[in-house]
């Protein structure tokens, strides 16, 4: 059956044979009702990847550097199944290039001109692509031929491979370049043992390097990782502490009409049957014809891309920096220590309308990018596509587990002038209920519930965490009737309350009439029996404070907070009456970003933040009429975090231990990929 | 309740120059930051420039140096001169405020421009 078979490309006669190898054997272990294996050759990987783009084959396996172009347009392929190497329990899909040096030296990633280097090999990518790359912009001009500036920027190098007589500074360290391992300090150990040695100050390795020379922890305690961030860190820390995430070797498949789930299905099967130790007449993962047929013989098994993953998010910001870099050329014209732009996301149409006026107000300082969810948002500012945005704690841990990282944390209690250096304990988050009923928190069960959104603090991660301990299932479209939790699967019981309109139904943005605290509040007000919202929400939009018609009738003393000893409250006592304390929102941005953000964001809150009184005649950064846009309209200002800018030490211990609890229930697709 | 009306738009040669101009009715003029937006066939709603009530601009780069924003006040009017104009400038262009704070859109019908030979 055609829709049934997977085309895999091969790029010679060896790869050919075992191709066709890999078909027989599939075709004797699977049902005819399976998928199937059929053998596309094509003379390289790069006319693989056209020719799937082209709908001329299905599958290859490609190395990061070729994933970088397979993603390119106009071919605009995805990786679908990775392998992993290492073993089951423990498997390993990435390697991270790193900048290794002695304890004793003290240098940063921004003072390595005029230092010596050691490199594993010429165009290698942990040894020369990623570290050149990224230092890229800091080499002197003219950048081509690459070698000589290169060696124009360190004062010796040993560059495996590189052109001796043309550039000799590159082979300073050891003469004559030699390309194999009658090299001392060719490849990953070579270049180690180069730095070991004294010849050289650096060596960009990869992070295991370290751990297969050195035995001895004392050893290896004598070198560090140098950090994009201009910091240092121990050899250990290696994924806090790289240039680049790379992925080891990679099938991909086209984005749209990929056969992604007959591709995973097929390969599932094939590592049954033909992995590593299972069968004597085929090997996956070997082969007599050759090394590396179709897979890396080092290969121990495949691993499924979580769907969520693109191509982006899968090599990294920092990789395809690097590898732009290289193929591109090209350097912004402002020098790189000076603060660019800042790209702001705004979720949807009304919040992008607040971030162009903001724009235009801040002399064009704050550029914005727009998406449709919170989730897509997080994914443009991993890639760079945007830098910032403001993210309620739910989202805040979400961010961090992607590499994001705190940067400002939005006050609401703190009066100026303290306010910008005043750390808050953070907000409650509140069941809200009409005072007419007679529910209490032990009796919400068939009853309809108001959710600010899946995944967010007060909204979700507080009351179904507290559910999820009670009732131990994840199922909690069950527990209530019927509800509005924006961000939930459009046929789910929990977005039957909501109110749209129609193609925003239940989106996790400000289309949808009950998203937010607002939002929340306004569907228990319409048609809930209860509201998970901040303490706040009822008093801001009670007595005449929200001017919308559906608001402007409101009495604060119409609604309670329930207590989870099963007691009732006035809206007045949430001290006395919550669910849980909440981390405030909070400012997030990739770590090369956050400096810039900070700095200008404290700059455009002296211009536009709480300290203007006229909102109707000036641009008020927080200010949208209820509607939270961009930042809480009950912020005063963004505070300094001083030591708390990981999300963990941001969000806190309990915090952070109940989402991570909660992870049983994820319906989040990015967090999924963040963590594969 | 704002209304707003652009008018000037029309067909012209690359290369050519046209002036847009946005009549506001309503007394929120002279307060309001406002601006430009455009929507080419098939695209989604792009900031073009923008001006603070106070008269400070802001351009996308795309258009940096070939338009020019700028308001009168008294007329309750604001202008875009386009100049330069290239094939990728061709859309609906729009003019709003942002006195309803994204509150309620005030949209006018837009007005065409077209940049062709």
């Known amino acids: 059956v055609p829709e049934k078979s997977v085309r895999w490309c091969a790029v010679s006669e060896h790869e050919a044979t075992k191709c066709q190898s890999f078909r027989d054997h599939m075709k004797s272990v699977l049902p005819s009702n399976g998928p199937s294996v059929a053998c596309v050759k094509k003379a390289s990987h790069l006319d693989c990847i056209r020719a799937i783009a082209a709908n001329e084959a299905d599958a290859v396996t490609l190395d990061a550097g070729l994933v970088y172009d397979a993603y390119l347009a106009p071919n605009n392929l995805k990786p679908v199944v990775a392998e992993f190497y290492g073993s089951k329990e423990d498997p390993q899909t990435f390697y991270y290039a790193v900048a290794v040096v002695k304890k004793d030296s003290d240098f940063q990633m921004n003072q390595l001109r005029g230092r010596k280097s050691c490199h594993t090999g010429l165009g290698r990518s942990a040894g020369w692509n990623i570290p050149i790359g990224l230092l890229y912009c800091d080499l002197p001009e003219p950048r081509k031929p690459l070698e000589k500036a290169v060696a124009n920027f360190f004062s010796g190098s040993c560059v495996p491979c590189a052109d001796g007589t043309d550039f000799p500074q590159l082979c300073q360290l050891c003469p004559g370049c030699g390309c194999s391992t009658l090299n001392q300090y060719f490849s990953y150990s070579g270049a180690f043992k180069c730095l070991k040695d004294g010849a050289g100050d650096v060596a960009f390795v990869k992070h295991s390097t370290i751990f297969e020379n050195l035995a001895n922890k004392a050893d290896r305690d004598q070198y560090e990782l140098l950090c994009l961030d201009n910091t240092r860190k121990s050899v250990d820390e290696y994924k806090d502490c790289h240039l680049a995430r790379v992925p080891s070797h990679t099938v991909v498949a086209r984005s749209v009409g990929g056969k992604e789930d007959l591709i995973w299905e097929l390969l599932n099967q094939a590592q049954e049957h033909f992995g590593k130790d299972k069968s004597k007449e085929f090997q996956l993962f070997s082969s007599p014809h050759g090394k590396d047929l179709l897979f890396k013989d080092s290969a121990h098994g495949f691993l499924k891309v979580p769907p969520r993953m693109d191509a982006k998010m899968y090599l990294g910001y920092e990789y395809i920096t690097a590898i732009r870099n290289l193929r591109e050329g090209t350097c912004p014209e402002a020098p790189t220590d000076e603060c660019k732009p800042v790209k702001w996301c705004a979720l949807s149409h009304h919040e992008r309308l607040k971030c162009d006026e903001w724009s235009v107000n801040s002399a064009g300082k704050i550029e914005c990018e727009s998406a449709e969810t919170t989730e897509d948002c997080i994914a443009k500012i991993m890639n760079g596509e945007a830098d910032a945005m403001s993210l309620d704690g739910g989202f805040v841990y979400i961010a961090g587990m992607c590499g994001l990282v705190p940067v400002l944390a939005e006050n609401y209690n703190t009066p100026n002038p303290n306010c910008e250096n005043t750390a808050e304990e953070g907000y409650f988050a509140v069941a809200v209920v009409k005072s007419s009923s007679d529910l209490t928190w032990d009796n919400l069960k068939g009853k309809k519930s108001c959710h600010t959104a899946v995944g967010r603090t007060a909204g979700w991660n507080i009351p179904m965490g507290l559910l999820y301990s009670k009732i131990n299932h994840c199922r909690f479209d069950e527990f209530f009737s019927e509800g509005c939790a924006p961000g939930s699967e459009k046929n789910s019981s929990l977005c039957k309350l909501c109110m749209g309109p129609s193609p925003n139904l239940c989106e996790p943005n400000n289309k949808e009439g009950y998203y937010g605290y607002t939002g929340a509040f306004r569907c228990l007000v319409e048609k809930g029996d209860v509201a998970f919202v901040k303490h706040q929400t009822v008093p801001q939009n009670t007595g005449g404070k929200n001017p919308d018609a559906w608001a402007k009738n409101l009495k604060e003393e119409d609604y309670e907070l329930l207590c989870l000893d099963g007691s009732r409250k006035s809206v007045q006592e949430p001290a006395n009456c919550h669910l849980a304390r909440a981390p405030n929102h909070a400012v997030v941005a990739r770590k090369d970003k956050a400096d810039c953000v900070q700095t200008l964001l404290l700059d455009q809150q002296r211009m536009f933040g709480s300290s203007v009184t006229d909102c109707s005649s000036n641009f008020c950064l927080f200010e949208s009429k209820t509607k939270d846009l961009l930042f809480r309209d009950d912020t005063v200002c963004l505070a300094k975090l001083h030591d708390r800018n990981t999300y963990e030490k941001y969000l806190g211990e309990e915090y952070v231990k109940a989402v991570t609890n909660l992870r049983k229930c994820s319906t989040s697709p990015l967090l999924e990929a963040c963590t594969f | 309740e704002v209304q707003l009306v652009e008018s000037g738009g029309g067909l012209v040669q690359p290369g050519g120059s046209l002036r847009l101009s946005c009549a506001a009715s309503?007394?929120?003029?002279?307060?309001?930051?406002m601006a430009w937006y455009r929507q080419a066939p098939g695209k989604g709603l792009e900031l073009v420039s923008g001006?603070?009530?106070?008269?400070?601009?802001n351009y996308r780069d795309s258009v940096k140096g070939r338009f020019t924003i700028s308001r009168d006040n008294s007329k309750n009017t604001m202008y875009l001169q386009m100049n330069s104009l290239r094939a990728e400038d061709t859309a609906v262009y729009y003019c709003t405020d942002y006195s309803s704070r994204y509150y309620h859109d005030y949209w006018g019908q837009g007005t065409l421009v077209t940049v062709s030979s």
């Open positions: 001006i603070t009530r106070s008269g400070s601009t």
């Open positions: 309503g007394s929120i003029f002279s307060i309001a930051t």
